[in-house]
């Protein structure tokens, strides 16, 4: 059995008080000092079984130098075994031993939970010499104890290579419950059960838990720590906390907000960054995510044209980055664009719609009926064609681009000419004789250069060899251009 020192119990209605027969103290006092000459202890505790020889860890000295008698075994005297006190109080406890004067250089060390206490600890050793023995009292004091001071303290003394160890003094620092696990904020699905956990420790134990939801107690009776609260589902945001009670009082956890997942708010600020003939680059600012991460977004595109069938094109894209290049659009067209994003709950409403336009496109067809013939008297090549049937979306014709490639004896040279939109014929100077000239023509608008016509080849003879027959693009269905010289 141990002798126990306790501070005075403060009854708390939910919990039993201290064990019968136990003592609590908050006095900063020297406990269980031995009666030694000239020293009066502040408190005395008689050993559990007075008069019984101590058979713990003792050192049995050899015979004296005279060889006449054996000295009694050395052992630390019994002291209080268990000190219970509140956090932030001061405590002082001690070990004492009487050592025959024949032993020199005795030192006492303090150990806590198997580790030696070194450095900045308040340990004092006092010596009280007598004729035959010296009473040694080693005191250990802690000011403003904390929970980390809890543990088993012992004294050790080395004599003649023997180690003498005291009984342990168990220090129990009591205080308000201390949370080791608190509820965490969560985002949950509406009307779906979920768990919250709360765990707190003493000492003193037991620690009992009350759950609080929106300021109302969930459990009418205390639950032992740890406690798991199964919340049966929520329809709106709620705040939870837990109260931990022990016989020192109550500690309240942080309050945590539990949010209900919902569909996101619609995106805002849809902006146009760049338009081309067939694409529009947009960006948007995501709305509130509804307490659930965005999964993806949908870009909805409607053509604004009284003649269009009003169908909506839908382009799915990742939620991040908040940007998307809409492709496969018609040139020179007006569109209404909206964005919607989704999370695990569902789709947001569509953002406010914005208007955007594509620019002019390049022509989609080449000029028709391209004819090429040589005008030797002027030393040039005459080219004629018909204006292509361009769509409105291609924009206004601004001219033509003529590509003529001259090939002779392994040499090839391409030249480009630009002519105005009112022309349907052009003349180019002969660059090389005894060579083949290959001509292609493309229509040009502000939107760009259209496709080139099929190549038409004409042979330019050496001087004096002239044939006025033209070369022209083939009639539809012919596989290759016809070359007439």
């Amino acid at each position: 059995a141990i002798t126990e020192a306790r501070e005075e119990a403060k009854p708390y209605p939910l919990f039993p008080g201290p064990l019968p027969g136990s003592l609590q103290t908050d006095h900063t006092s020297l406990l269980s000092l031995p009666h030694t000459s000239g020293y009066q202890p502040a408190l005395m505790f008689s050993p559990t079984q007075p008069g019984r020889p101590y058979t713990g860890n003792v050192a049995i000295p050899r015979v004296t130098s005279a060889g006449s008698k054996l000295l009694p075994p050395l052992a630390f005297k019994h002291t209080v075994g268990h000190i219970i006190l509140s956090e932030h109080k001061d405590v002082k406890f001690n070990c004492s031993i009487s050592v025959p004067n024949i032993y020199q250089d005795t030192t006492i060390s303090w150990w806590k939970d198997g580790k030696e206490l070194l450095g900045a600890h308040h340990a004092i050793t006092q010596f009280y010499p007598d004729d035959e023995v010296t009473a040694i009292i080693a005191s250990f004091s802690i000011t403003s104890v904390q929970r980390s001071d809890n543990g088993s303290y012992i004294c050790k003394m080395k004599i003649n290579n023997e180690e003498i160890v005291s009984d342990p003094i168990y220090i129990e620092v009591q205080g308000l419950p201390h949370f080791t696990k608190q509820p965490e904020s969560m985002n949950v699905t509406r009307n779906t059960a979920f768990n919250l956990t709360c765990q707190a420790v003493g000492p003193p134990e037991p620690v009992n838990i009350f759950w609080v939801q929106n300021s109302s107690r969930v459990n009418e009776q205390p639950e032992k720590s740890p406690s798991v609260l199964t919340v049966p589902g929520l329809t709106e945001m709620a705040v939870f906390s837990c109260e931990a009670h022990n016989d020192k009082g109550l500690t309240v956890s942080k309050g945590v907000q539990i949010n209900i997942k919902a569909i996101p708010s619609p995106p805002t600020e849809v902006s146009i960054h760049n338009s081309t003939a067939h694409s529009i680059l947009i960006s948007w600012v995501p709305g509130f995510d509804g307490y659930s991460p965005f999964r993806n977004c949908s870009v909805q595109v409607k053509e604004v044209d009284p003649l269009s069938n009003g169908s909506v094109m839908i382009f799915n894209t990742s939620a991040s980055p908040h940007m998307y290049q809409i492709k496969q659009l018609q040139a020179l067209a007006n569109y209404s664009i909206g964005v919607s994003c989704m999370n695990e709950i569902g789709w947001s409403a569509v953002s406010p719609w914005i208007l955007a336009s594509t620019t002019e496109g390049a022509p989609s067809v080449a000029p028709l009926n391209v004819t090429v013939f040589l005008n030797e008297s002027r030393d040039n090549v005459d080219i004629r064609w018909m204006k292509p049937l361009t769509k409105r979306q291609a924009g206004e014709l601004v001219g033509y681009r003529i590509s003529h490639v001259w090939q002779s004896a392994g040499i090839s040279k391409e030249l480009l000419e630009e002519v105005g939109q009112n022309n349907s014929r052009a003349q180019i100077s002969v660059q090389v004789h005894n060579a083949t000239c290959t001509v292609r023509i493309a229509a040009v608008t502000k939107g760009g250069v259209g496709p080139f016509s099929d190549p038409v080849k004409i042979f330019i003879p050496a001087h004096g060899w002239v044939d006025h027959a033209p070369s022209s693009t083939p009639a539809p269905g012919n596989a290759d251009p016809v070359l007439i010289i």
Epitope: L14, N219, G233, A238
Partner: antibody, heavy 118, light 106 residues
Amino acid sequence: QVQLVQSGSELKKPGASVKVSCKASGYTFTNYGVHWVRQAPGQGLEWMGWINTYTGEPTYAQGFTGRFVFSLDTSVSTAYLQISSLKAEDTAVYYCARGVRYAYMDYWGQGTLVTVSS
Amino acid sequence: EIVLTQSPATLSLSPGERATLSCRASSSVGYMHWYQQKPGQAPRPLIYATSNLASGIPARFSGSGSGTSYTLTISSPEPEDFAVYYCQQWSSNPRTFGGGTKVEIK
């Protein structure tokens, strides 16, 4: 299995006292509160209050203070409702029920009819 | 205290006809519990915390609601469902019951 068994019907004269018992079994009695509910003839349910079986602390609803006393004997897992100075309007069926989280009454006694008549 | 008003006081139905029982609170409550009582019997737990079926209760019973408005629905009542139904709030003391709705056979 969880059971709440109440004492039998009582016929009392005005001014007398009655003590209704509610014996619990099938669970740890001190882990759950015991609620008391009154139902007058042809009327609805009326919550009277509850007793904390861990501390013995009673809580009374308005209108049930003074003459009504909740008590416990945890050694026999039993809750009691005592009504003193009985009046004719105390004639009712009295139910005990086990209280769990969110003040939900998950198990009920079979009810005790107390009749107050001269 | 929070007053719970149940409506209608009586609901006359043919078996199989959907029943919708309402319980309104005088101020917002966290959860609503529902109990069924048949003549001469103790109340029987039906729905816990607004929408959770008590043990052994068939799926034709369902609960919903939030704030001050709560509903108990019997999708297709069986003959044994004709009884009195009470709501009870959890939020603040005192715990209160509604006045009850009697579901009877038309």
